[in-house]
Amino acid sequence: YDFTNCDFEKIKAAYLSTISKDLITYMSGTKSTEFNNTVSCSNRPHCLTEIQSLTFNPTAGCASLAKEMFAMKTKAALAIWCPGYSETQINATQAMKKRRKRKVTTNKCLEQVSQLQGLWRRFNRPLLKQQ
């Protein structure tokens, strides 16, 4: 999906008002220095591509993020403010709804969410030069 036509300011507002708090709640008890940020993004559409991938694509050691509150809010935000996004995600979403796996917060998931926090922070500062 091409995130170019998204309403970035509305997504940013949703992140600042609610998604960021859910990410912090998920990471509670974890030191902010515990994980190094290894995933980066260069502009807002690229950041949303990376955020979507890390949030909704199961990875080795972390298959359960899609049912977390921050993920559900992210999906709703992309659906509401990125035209046509939801139609490209139908099959993935139906599969997600069928996989009602028990939520397990593994160290790998914590690392992944730490990467997400970094991507979201970068999304909110699009004019900063890449480090």
């Epitope: 036509n5 709703a76 935000a77 403010w81 046509g84 139908i90």
Partner: antibody
Framework: QVQLVQSGAEVKKPGSSVKVSCKAS????????ISWVRQAPGQGLEWMGH????????NYAQKFQGRVTITADESTSTAYMELSSLRSEDTAVYYC?????????????WGQGTLVTVSS | DIQMTQSPSSLSASVGDRVTITCRAS??????LNWYQQKPGKAPKLLIY???SLQSGVPSRFSGSGSGTDFTLTISSLQPEDFAVYYC?????????FGQGTKVEIK
Amino acid sequence: QVQLVQSGAEVKKPGSSVKVSCKASGGTFSSYAISWVRQAPGQGLEWMGHISPEFGFTNYAQKFQGRVTITADESTSTAYMELSSLRSEDTAVYYCARSGMFYSILFDYWGQGTLVTVSS
Amino acid sequence: DIQMTQSPSSLSASVGDRVTITCRASQDIYNYLNWYQQKPGKAPKLLIYGASSLQSGVPSRFSGSGSGTDFTLTISSLQPEDFAVYYCQQQNDYPLTFGQGTKVEIK
């Protein structure tokens, strides 16, 4: 089967506001975006905006920004569209619409429409 | 805003005819194009989404094609219940916009 039932016809004075309701039944309400589309007499269709009921995220067409407010009450599975500062050109049938697919913005279920007449 | 232009604005046809309605977008909308049918006094009904996917329950005589800026709705053999107004709608960018409609009338 999803059903959307809208409130009845309204006659309003210019400058006033109108609030139209849309009650959903037959299926979960929260995870499906509800849109509002209007149609002036003998005219085409015009998208006004939509809401994600679960989290209250809204998106409005620029044309209606500042005049329209879309809300949703999860406890009653009802969405609302309020239009303020009414003028005669707001006379139209107002439809709520939603998809049968999770978070989709396709309009495959529609309310029966609510005629709003703005007249002095 | 993306402008959607339909042609013709109205047409007369007989039962059994093959009918083609075109829709042009003012900019590239990929395949984010849907078609709706509306009968007098009724809400619109989704026929085609994603330019060519037939909505569940819609007869196979309806088909859609195109991508980019030019799209077509075809009714292969017009039936009495198909006399209505047809609208195209883009969902590539907000605000979502509709064509002005094409009225299909009985000849």
